[in-house]
Amino acid sequence: MNGRVDYLVTEEEINLTRGPSGLGFNIVGGTDQQYVSNDSGIYVSRIKENGAAALDGRLQEGDKILSVNGQDLKNLLHQDAVDLFRNAGYAVSLRVQHRLQVQNGPIGHRGEGDPSG
Protein backbone atom coordinates (compact mmCIF):
# COMPACT_ATOMS: atom_id res chain seq x y z
CA MET A 1 0.00 0.00 0.00
CA ASN A 2 1.32 3.43 -0.86
CA GLY A 3 2.04 6.03 1.81
CA ARG A 4 -0.09 9.14 2.03
CA VAL A 5 1.51 12.51 1.34
CA ASP A 6 0.48 15.24 3.75
CA TYR A 7 1.58 18.84 3.98
CA LEU A 8 2.54 20.81 7.03
CA VAL A 9 1.70 24.46 6.39
CA THR A 10 3.36 27.12 8.51
CA GLU A 11 3.56 30.90 8.30
CA GLU A 12 6.52 33.09 9.09
CA GLU A 13 7.44 36.77 9.10
CA ILE A 14 10.76 37.35 7.31
CA ASN A 15 12.54 40.69 7.34
CA LEU A 16 15.01 41.30 4.53
CA THR A 17 17.31 44.19 3.66
CA ARG A 18 17.44 44.99 -0.03
CA GLY A 19 20.76 44.23 -1.71
CA PRO A 20 22.32 45.65 -4.89
CA SER A 21 20.11 43.45 -7.05
CA GLY A 22 16.96 43.45 -4.99
CA LEU A 23 15.78 41.00 -2.37
CA GLY A 24 17.43 37.99 -3.97
CA PHE A 25 14.52 35.89 -5.18
CA ASN A 26 12.27 35.52 -8.21
CA ILE A 27 8.50 35.24 -8.21
CA VAL A 28 5.85 33.59 -10.33
CA GLY A 29 2.08 33.64 -10.09
CA GLY A 30 -0.68 36.22 -10.16
CA THR A 31 -4.23 36.34 -11.45
CA ASP A 32 -2.97 36.37 -15.04
CA GLN A 33 -0.30 33.67 -14.56
CA GLN A 34 -1.43 31.04 -12.09
CA TYR A 35 1.53 29.00 -10.92
CA VAL A 36 -0.63 26.63 -8.87
CA SER A 37 -3.94 25.46 -10.29
CA ASN A 38 -6.87 27.51 -8.94
CA ASP A 39 -4.49 29.69 -6.92
CA SER A 40 -3.51 33.15 -8.10
CA GLY A 41 -1.01 33.57 -5.27
CA ILE A 42 2.59 34.72 -5.58
CA TYR A 43 5.25 32.03 -5.16
CA VAL A 44 9.03 32.02 -4.88
CA SER A 45 10.48 30.32 -7.95
CA ARG A 46 14.17 30.85 -7.29
CA ILE A 47 16.45 31.92 -4.46
CA LYS A 48 19.51 33.68 -5.84
CA GLU A 49 22.90 32.61 -4.60
CA ASN A 50 24.44 35.20 -2.24
CA GLY A 51 21.33 37.39 -2.44
CA ALA A 52 19.54 38.86 0.56
CA ALA A 53 17.08 35.95 0.85
CA ALA A 54 19.79 33.29 0.55
CA LEU A 55 21.95 34.98 3.17
CA ASP A 56 18.97 35.17 5.55
CA GLY A 57 18.28 31.49 4.90
CA ARG A 58 14.58 31.24 5.79
CA LEU A 59 12.81 31.83 2.49
CA GLN A 60 12.61 28.71 0.32
CA GLU A 61 11.77 28.02 -3.30
CA GLY A 62 8.08 27.10 -3.43
CA ASP A 63 7.09 29.37 -0.54
CA LYS A 64 3.96 31.45 -1.03
CA ILE A 65 4.32 35.14 -0.24
CA LEU A 66 1.19 36.36 1.50
CA SER A 67 2.09 40.00 2.06
CA VAL A 68 4.81 42.60 1.57
CA ASN A 69 5.15 45.27 4.27
CA GLY A 70 1.64 44.36 5.41
CA GLN A 71 0.13 44.67 1.95
CA ASP A 72 -1.83 41.59 0.91
CA LEU A 73 -0.78 39.90 -2.35
CA LYS A 74 -4.19 38.36 -3.04
CA ASN A 75 -5.76 38.88 -6.47
CA LEU A 76 -2.88 40.79 -8.01
CA LEU A 77 -1.72 40.74 -11.61
CA HIS A 78 1.81 39.37 -11.92
CA GLN A 79 3.28 42.75 -12.89
CA ASP A 80 1.49 44.50 -10.03
CA ALA A 81 3.09 42.05 -7.61
CA VAL A 82 6.49 42.66 -9.20
CA ASP A 83 6.00 46.40 -8.81
CA LEU A 84 5.19 45.94 -5.12
CA PHE A 85 8.54 44.22 -4.59
CA ARG A 86 10.39 46.78 -6.69
CA ASN A 87 8.96 49.65 -4.67
CA ALA A 88 8.98 48.04 -1.24
CA GLY A 89 11.87 50.06 0.13
CA TYR A 90 15.15 49.15 1.79
CA ALA A 91 13.86 47.10 4.72
CA VAL A 92 11.15 44.69 3.63
CA SER A 93 8.85 42.55 5.75
CA LEU A 94 7.46 39.42 4.10
CA ARG A 95 4.70 37.20 5.44
CA VAL A 96 5.32 33.80 3.89
CA GLN A 97 3.71 30.40 3.89
CA HIS A 98 5.97 27.36 3.93
CA ARG A 99 4.47 24.08 2.74
CA LEU A 100 6.51 21.15 3.97
CA GLN A 101 5.78 17.75 2.45
CA VAL A 102 5.41 15.03 5.06
CA GLN A 103 5.56 11.43 3.88
CA ASN A 104 3.51 9.16 6.12
CA GLY A 105 4.08 5.44 6.24
CA PRO A 106 1.71 2.88 4.70
CA ILE A 107 -1.72 2.82 6.30
CA GLY A 108 -2.76 -0.55 7.72
CA HIS A 109 -2.57 -2.78 10.77
CA ARG A 110 0.61 -4.36 12.04
CA GLY A 111 1.16 -7.93 10.92
CA GLU A 112 1.33 -10.79 13.41
CA GLY A 113 5.05 -11.24 12.96
CA ASP A 114 5.87 -7.54 13.37
CA PRO A 115 7.83 -6.48 16.42
CA SER A 116 5.56 -4.70 18.91
CA GLY A 117 7.36 -1.39 19.46
Partner: nanobody, 126 residues
Framework: DVQLVESGGGLVQPGGSLRLSCAAS????????IGWFRQAPGKEREGVSC???????YYADSVKGRFTISRDNVKNTLYLQMNSLKPEDTALYYC????????????????????WGQGTQVTVSS
Protein backbone atom coordinates in the same frame (compact mmCIF):
# COMPACT_ATOMS: atom_id res chain seq x y z
CA ASP B 1 27.78 46.59 -9.54
CA VAL B 2 25.28 45.03 -11.97
CA GLN B 3 26.24 45.61 -15.59
CA LEU B 4 24.98 44.36 -18.96
CA VAL B 5 27.06 45.00 -22.10
CA GLU B 6 25.73 44.16 -25.57
CA SER B 7 27.79 43.51 -28.70
CA GLY B 8 27.46 41.91 -32.10
CA GLY B 9 25.33 44.44 -33.93
CA GLY B 10 26.15 45.77 -37.37
CA LEU B 11 25.02 46.27 -40.94
CA VAL B 12 23.69 43.17 -42.68
CA GLN B 13 21.82 42.50 -45.92
CA PRO B 14 18.25 41.22 -45.91
CA GLY B 15 18.23 37.47 -45.41
CA GLY B 16 21.49 37.61 -43.49
CA SER B 17 22.32 36.61 -39.91
CA LEU B 18 23.80 38.16 -36.79
CA ARG B 19 24.46 36.92 -33.28
CA LEU B 20 24.09 39.43 -30.48
CA SER B 21 25.80 38.93 -27.11
CA CYS B 22 25.00 40.38 -23.72
CA ALA B 23 27.75 39.93 -21.15
CA ALA B 24 26.65 40.21 -17.53
CA SER B 25 28.82 41.23 -14.61
CA UNK B 26 27.93 41.73 -10.97
CA UNK B 27 25.32 39.00 -10.97
CA UNK B 28 24.77 35.42 -12.10
CA UNK B 29 22.81 35.46 -15.34
CA UNK B 30 20.94 32.20 -14.83
CA UNK B 31 19.42 33.50 -11.60
CA UNK B 32 17.35 36.00 -13.57
CA UNK B 33 14.62 36.26 -16.14
CA ILE B 34 16.28 38.26 -18.86
CA GLY B 35 15.58 39.19 -22.45
CA TRP B 36 16.23 41.10 -25.62
CA PHE B 37 14.37 44.29 -26.49
CA ARG B 38 14.54 46.59 -29.47
CA GLN B 39 13.57 50.11 -30.33
CA ALA B 40 13.42 51.51 -33.84
CA PRO B 41 13.42 55.28 -34.41
CA GLY B 42 9.98 56.72 -33.73
CA LYS B 43 8.62 53.42 -32.45
CA GLU B 44 7.90 52.01 -29.01
CA ARG B 45 10.29 49.60 -27.37
CA GLU B 46 9.39 45.97 -28.11
CA GLY B 47 10.20 42.78 -26.22
CA VAL B 48 11.81 40.46 -28.76
CA SER B 49 12.63 37.35 -26.76
CA CYS B 50 12.96 36.51 -23.06
CA UNK B 51 14.05 33.54 -20.98
CA UNK B 52 13.18 32.69 -17.38
CA UNK B 53 15.70 31.51 -14.80
CA UNK B 54 14.42 27.97 -15.41
CA UNK B 55 14.85 28.21 -19.19
CA UNK B 56 11.29 28.86 -20.41
CA UNK B 57 11.36 31.07 -23.49
CA TYR B 58 9.10 33.62 -25.14
CA TYR B 59 9.33 35.08 -28.66
CA ALA B 60 7.43 37.96 -30.17
CA ASP B 61 5.30 36.84 -33.11
CA SER B 62 7.37 38.96 -35.48
CA VAL B 63 10.55 36.95 -34.81
CA LYS B 64 9.25 33.42 -34.18
CA GLY B 65 11.14 30.85 -36.23
CA ARG B 66 13.89 33.33 -37.09
CA PHE B 67 15.43 34.34 -33.75
CA THR B 68 16.76 32.09 -30.99
CA ILE B 69 17.58 33.14 -27.45
CA SER B 70 20.17 31.21 -25.44
CA ARG B 71 22.34 31.56 -22.38
CA ASP B 72 25.87 30.40 -21.59
CA ASN B 73 26.06 30.10 -17.82
CA VAL B 74 29.83 29.54 -17.82
CA LYS B 75 30.49 32.74 -19.79
CA ASN B 76 27.61 34.50 -18.00
CA THR B 77 26.40 35.70 -21.39
CA LEU B 78 23.02 35.92 -23.11
CA TYR B 79 22.77 35.50 -26.88
CA LEU B 80 20.30 36.27 -29.63
CA GLN B 81 20.84 34.40 -32.88
CA MET B 82 19.04 36.33 -35.60
CA ASN B 83 18.48 34.62 -38.97
CA SER B 84 16.56 35.62 -42.11
CA LEU B 85 16.85 39.27 -41.11
CA LYS B 86 14.41 41.78 -42.60
CA PRO B 87 14.62 45.56 -42.97
CA GLU B 88 11.93 45.87 -40.27
CA ASP B 89 14.34 44.25 -37.79
CA THR B 90 16.45 47.40 -37.94
CA ALA B 91 16.62 48.83 -34.41
CA LEU B 92 18.75 49.40 -31.36
CA TYR B 93 18.81 46.07 -29.46
CA TYR B 94 19.11 45.97 -25.66
CA CYS B 95 19.24 43.24 -23.09
CA UNK B 96 17.49 43.76 -19.78
CA UNK B 97 16.79 41.77 -16.63
CA UNK B 98 14.10 41.70 -13.98
CA UNK B 99 15.19 41.34 -10.36
CA UNK B 100 11.84 39.78 -9.40
CA UNK B 101 9.69 38.42 -12.22
CA UNK B 102 10.48 34.89 -13.33
CA UNK B 103 7.78 34.88 -15.98
CA UNK B 104 9.38 35.29 -19.40
CA UNK B 105 6.22 36.64 -21.05
CA UNK B 106 5.73 39.30 -18.36
CA UNK B 107 9.39 40.31 -18.59
CA UNK B 108 9.16 40.80 -22.35
CA UNK B 109 5.99 42.86 -21.96
CA UNK B 110 7.23 44.93 -19.04
CA UNK B 111 8.25 48.56 -18.93
CA UNK B 112 9.55 48.07 -15.40
CA UNK B 113 12.85 46.21 -15.61
CA UNK B 114 15.77 46.62 -13.26
CA UNK B 115 18.99 46.34 -15.25
CA TRP B 116 19.54 47.56 -18.79
CA GLY B 117 22.44 47.52 -21.20
CA GLN B 118 23.36 50.41 -23.48
CA GLY B 119 22.32 48.63 -26.67
CA THR B 120 23.86 47.55 -29.98
CA GLN B 121 22.64 48.81 -33.34
CA VAL B 122 21.34 46.37 -35.95
CA THR B 123 20.74 47.69 -39.45
CA VAL B 124 19.27 45.49 -42.16
CA SER B 125 19.66 47.10 -45.55
CA SER B 126 20.80 46.28 -49.06
Amino acid sequence: DVQLVESGGGLVQPGGSLRLSCAASGFTLDDYAIGWFRQAPGKEREGVSCISSHGSTYYADSVKGRFTISRDNVKNTLYLQMNSLKPEDTALYYCAASYYSDYEVAVCRSDALDAWGQGTQVTVSS
